[in-house]
Structures are given as structure tokens and as C-alpha cells.
Amino acid sequence: MNSFNYTTPDYGHYDDKDTLDLNTPVDKTSNTLRVPD
């Protein structure tokens, strides 16, 4: 088990604004420090 206890957000629970603010990856192409998919 991953020691970080990540939660999977229920996307249907959020409006558009909140969905855009979720901890989901931003950088789809670059090799900068980023959130793992």
C-alpha cells in the first residue's frame, strides 16, 4: 500500500470551478517536476 493515503475525488461532486482546482496534473508534456498521473 502507498503510505500516502491518496484520495480519489468524486468528480461528479464538484462544479466546474472546483474540478479545475483539484490536485490533478497540469503539465501534460514537459518533464518539469509534476504530479504523477
Epitope: F4, L20, L22, N23, V26, K28, R34
Partner: antibody, heavy 114, light 112 residues
């Protein structure tokens, strides 16, 4: 309601380090990312990157890699921006904002001068 | 990086008259999730920016309906159908589709 409250103005000398705080309230801090935005005096806005408040992983844009560090104190619902080896061109107002810039802090003015 | 081009840079408008700001991007802002992540902010003098419109045309909470946003692809517009005194400030369009997110230079709305 959602609020982001930043630390007060800073006056620093070149070469020093500053740490700006951004305390969030009114929502679950670890659900939503936090962005940082720079605004030099009389200039426009520049996105510095963001930090995943769940994993703690920062993402920096090219112009803000190296001397800049995003960090968290999740127990206090607080995000931090640290700038080291300060330069005159770091003089600006720094804003925290929830990831997609719909909610903003009031800004922290940093002046770097010898 | 995606370049966001705003025009005009300054807009001088009489209260009660309409105003329009154009924003063009150097690449399409239609994202792979089907959303066009073009947003508008207003920064009043001495204040932090405030979200006005998100996803091209959605009015943020508390924003009066005299503001409307439209456009698609690379060409977007913010319109105010009757300018009020509280509307003065700098309007920024910005894109959250392509990394890094980028802003227009801003359009300063002045009251005549």
C-alpha cells in the same frame, strides 16, 4: 467562505531569503491545489507554478526554477513560497491563489533593496 | 509558451456605455478534456485580482450579468453592456490549457 490570507510585507537585502505564507480556510485544504503568481511593480501577472496539496509535489515554470520553493504545512492549512538568494528583480507582489486562480490571497509585497 | 494578445491596451468608456475587450491566443485553448480553459480576471486599483468569467463564458459568483464572455478556439471577447464606475481596473485574460499557464498583458479600463 473561502479565504486565503497571506503574511505581511517584507523588506529584504540582496542575497537574503524570504518565506511568504498563505493560510487557507473555508474548504478542505488538501483537496485543491495552490498556485503562486508574481506581479512586478506596474506590471502584469506571471504564473509561477503550483503545489499539489495532497502529495506536496511542486510544479515550477521555467522562470521560477532554482531559487524558488513551494511547501506546505497541511496541519495548519498553509502554503509557503520561499525565495532564496534574493535579487532586486524579485521585488514584486506575490499572490497565492487556489489552483485555477478563482480565489486569491490579498498579496504580499516583497521589496529587495540594499 | 502560449502568447495571449489583448486589445485594446487602454479603454476609456463613459458610464452607461458598452465596452468590449478582445483576447487572442497563439494556440487553440480547447483542451483534451473538451473544456476551453480561457478565463478573465479583473484587478481593481490596489487590490488582488478577482475572477470574473471562467471557461470562456461562465460568470463567477457575485459577478453582475452585465458581463458576458464568448469565443472559441483562439479568439475570445469580454463584453460589458453598460459600464459602471466599479468596473474600472485592469482586465486580464489567461489560459489554463497549455503549460505554463499564461496571461494577457491586461487591458486598462478607464472611466471617461
Amino acid at each position: 467562505q473561502i479565504q486565503l490570507v497571506q503574511s505581511g510585507p517584507e523588506l529584504k537585502k540582496p542575497g537574503e531569503t524570504v518565506k511568504i505564507s498563505c493560510k487557507a480556510s473555508g474548504y478542505t485544504f488538501t483537496t485543491f491545489g495552490m498556485s503562486w503568481v508574481k506581479q512586478a511593480p506596474g506590471k502584469g501577472l506571471k504564473w509561477m507554478g503550483w503545489i499539489n496539496t495532497n502529495s506536496g509535489m511542486p510544479t515550477y515554470t521555467d522562470d521560477f526554477r532554482g531559487r524558488f520553493a513551494f511547501s506546505l504545512e497541511t496541519s495548519a492549512s498553509t502554503a509557503y513560497l520561499q525565495i532564496s538568494s534574493l535579487k532586486n528583480e524579485d521585488t514584486a507582489t506575490y499572490f497565492c491563489a487556489r489552483k485555477s486562480l478563482f480565489y486569491w490571497g490579498q498579496g504580499t509585497t516583497l521589496t529587495v533593496s540594499s | 509558451d502560449v502568447v495571449m494578445t489583448q486589445s485594446p491596451l487602454t479603454l476609456s468608456v463613459t458610464i452607461g456605455q458598452p465596452a468590449s475587450i478582445s483576447c487572442r491566443s497563439s494556440r487553440s485553448l480547447l483542451d483534451s478534456d473538451g473544456k476551453t480553459k480561457l478565463h478573465w480576471l479583473l484587478q481593481r486599483p490596489g487590490q488582488s485580482p478577482k475572477s470574473l468569467i471562467y471557461l470562456v463564458s461562465k460568470l463567477d459568483s457575485g459577478v453582475p450579468n452585465r458581463f458576458t464572455g464568448g469565443g472559441s478556439g483562439t479568439d475570445f471577447t469580454l463584453k460589458i453592456n453598460r459600464v459602471e464606475a466599479e468596473d474600472l481596473g485592469v482586465y486580464y485574460c489567461w489560459q489554463g490549457t497549455h503549460f505554463p499557464w499564461t496571461f494577457g498583458v491586461g487591458t486598462k479600463l478607464e472611466i471617461k
